[in-house]
Amino acid sequence: QGWQAFKNDATEIIPELGEYPEPPPELENNKTMNRAENGGRPPHHPFETKDVSEYSCRELHFTRYVTDGPCRSAKPVTELVCSGQCGPARLLPNAIGRGKWWRPSGPDFRCIPDRYRAQRVQLLCPGGEAPRARKVRLVASCKCKRLTRFHNQSELKDFGTEAARPQKGRKPRPRARSAKANQAELENAY
C-alpha cells in the first residue's frame, strides 16, 4: 500500500528499545477514490485544488495501557495519533473513465509526529513480581511534512512507511489511514 499515514496508536515507544511500526496491511476500502459517480460527469473532490497550507493533521487522542510481557501499566497513557489529509492530490480517471482514483501530485505530504514527550510509567506484574518502571515516549504534536518519493528507506523510518509505490493491481491512495499501522510498535519494542 502506498503511503499510509503514520499511526501511533500503540504508544509505547521505548527510546532505547523501540522499533518503528511496519506498514499497515492493504486497505480494501477504495470507494473514495475509485467509484463511478455523478453519471460519468467529472467527479468533484474536496482535495483537488486547495493550497497545502489549508490542510492539517487530525488531532485524535487515544488512551491505552503499556504492556511488557505479562506486565501492565497501573494507569493508561494518552497521546496524539497522527493522521489526516495533509496535502492536495490530483484525481485521474480510472480505466472505465467514469470513476476516479488518487495519485500523489508531485511531492507528498505526511502527517507525522513532530514533538514527543517522555512519561514514566509503573508496570504491575503478576505472581508477586516487583513493579517495574519504564519510560515511554509519547507523541505530543503532529505536523505535515513534505516528502518526495525519492526519500530512501532510512529517511522514512520515522514515519513507519515504505517509499510510495502502488500495490500490484491497486490504485495508489495517498494518506489512507489504517488502525493497524502502529500495532507492531509495542509488540516489537521488547
Partner: antibody, heavy 119, light 107 residues
Framework: QVQLVQSGAEVKKPGASVKVSCKAS????????MYWVRQAPGQGLEWMGI????????SYAQKFQGRVTMTRDTSTSTVYMELSSLRSEDTAVYYC????????????WGQGTLVTVSS | DIQMTQSPSSLSASVGDRVTITCRAS??????LNWYQQKPGKAPNLLIY???GLQSGVPSRFSGSGSGTDFTLTISSLQPEDFGTYYC?????????FGQGTRLEIK
C-alpha cells in the same frame, strides 16, 4: 459487502449496566476505527467514543469517562460498548459506526440498539 | 472541545426551492467536516465528506462548501424525499462533535 450488525434492544433498571455488541463483516476488521454514537429520543447525535480494533486503544467523550468501556474481540470481529451506572437519561438508540480510512467520515453504521432505562 | 453550531434549527421549504444550512465550528477544523441526513427511525446517511466531497450515490443537487470554521450545505432544488434532519460533524479532533441538527420539512 460491509455490514455492522448490532445486538438487540435492552431494557435496564437505573444503576445497572448494559453491553451492546457490534459485529463487523465484509472487510478487514482491524483496519478501521469503530465509533459509538448515541441518540436520545427526539434528540441529536452524540459521540461517545472510538476504539482502534487493532490495538484496542480508545478515546472516550468526557461525559462518559468512567462509565463507558469499549472493547473488541478480533477473533469474532466484534466491538462492544458497555455503559454502567445507567440512568433514565441514557435511554437512547446506540449506534456503532465505521470510519472511512481516508476521509475521516462514518461510511457504515449499525442498525442501532435501543436501550431503555426505566424503573 | 470544538462546538458545532448549526442554523437554522428547523426550516420548511417547497419542492424546487434552494435550501442552505450552515455550520460553524468554534475553532478551525480545516476541511474535516461531514454532513449527514437522517430519516426517522434510521441511522444517519452520509451526504458530504471533507466539507465538499459528494458521497457516492448522493444526488448532485447536494453540495457542500467551506473551510476553517464556516461551512454550508446546499440543496439546489429541493425534492420531496429530502425531508429529514441534517447534521454536520467535525472529525478534526477528539472529542468528535456534531451540530445540533436542522430539521427540514417539505411545505
Amino acid at each position: 459487502q460491509v455490514q455492522l450488525v448490532q445486538s438487540g434492544a435492552e431494557v435496564k433498571k437505573p444503576g445497572a449496566s448494559v453491553k451492546v455488541s457490534c459485529k463487523a463483516s465484509g472487510y478487514t476488521f482491524t483496519n478501521y476505527y469503530m465509533y459509538w454514537v448515541r441518540q436520545a429520543p427526539g434528540q441529536g447525535l452524540e459521540w461517545m467514543g472510538i476504539i482502534n480494533p487493532s490495538g484496542g486503544s480508545t478515546s472516550y467523550a468526557q461525559k462518559f469517562q468512567g462509565r463507558v468501556t469499549m472493547t473488541r474481540d478480533t477473533s469474532t470481529s466484534t466491538v462492544y460498548m458497555e455503559l454502567s451506572s445507567l440512568r433514565s437519561e441514557d435511554t437512547a438508540v446506540y449506534y456503532c459506526a465505521r470510519e472511512d480510512t481516508a476521509m475521516a467520515y462514518f461510511d457504515y453504521w449499525g442498525q442501532g440498539t435501543l436501550v431503555t432505562v426505566s424503573s | 472541545d470544538i462546538q458545532m453550531t448549526q442554523s437554522p434549527s428547523s426550516l420548511s421549504a417547497s419542492v424546487g426551492d434552494r435550501v442552505t444550512i450552515t455550520c460553524r465550528a468554534s475553532q478551525t477544523i480545516s476541511n474535516y467536516l461531514n454532513w449527514y441526513q437522517q430519516k426517522p427511525g434510521k441511522a444517519p446517511n452520509l451526504l458530504i465528506y471533507a466539507a465538499s466531497g459528494l458521497q457516492s450515490g448522493v444526488p448532485s443537487r447536494f453540495s457542500g462548501s467551506g473551510s476553517g470554521t464556516d461551512f454550508t450545505l446546499t440543496i439546489s432544488s429541493l425534492q420531496p424525499e429530502d425531508f429529514g434532519t441534517y447534521y454536520c460533524q467535525q472529525s478534526f479532533s477528539t472529542p468528535i462533535t456534531f451540530g445540533q441538527g436542522t430539521r427540514l420539512e417539505i411545505k
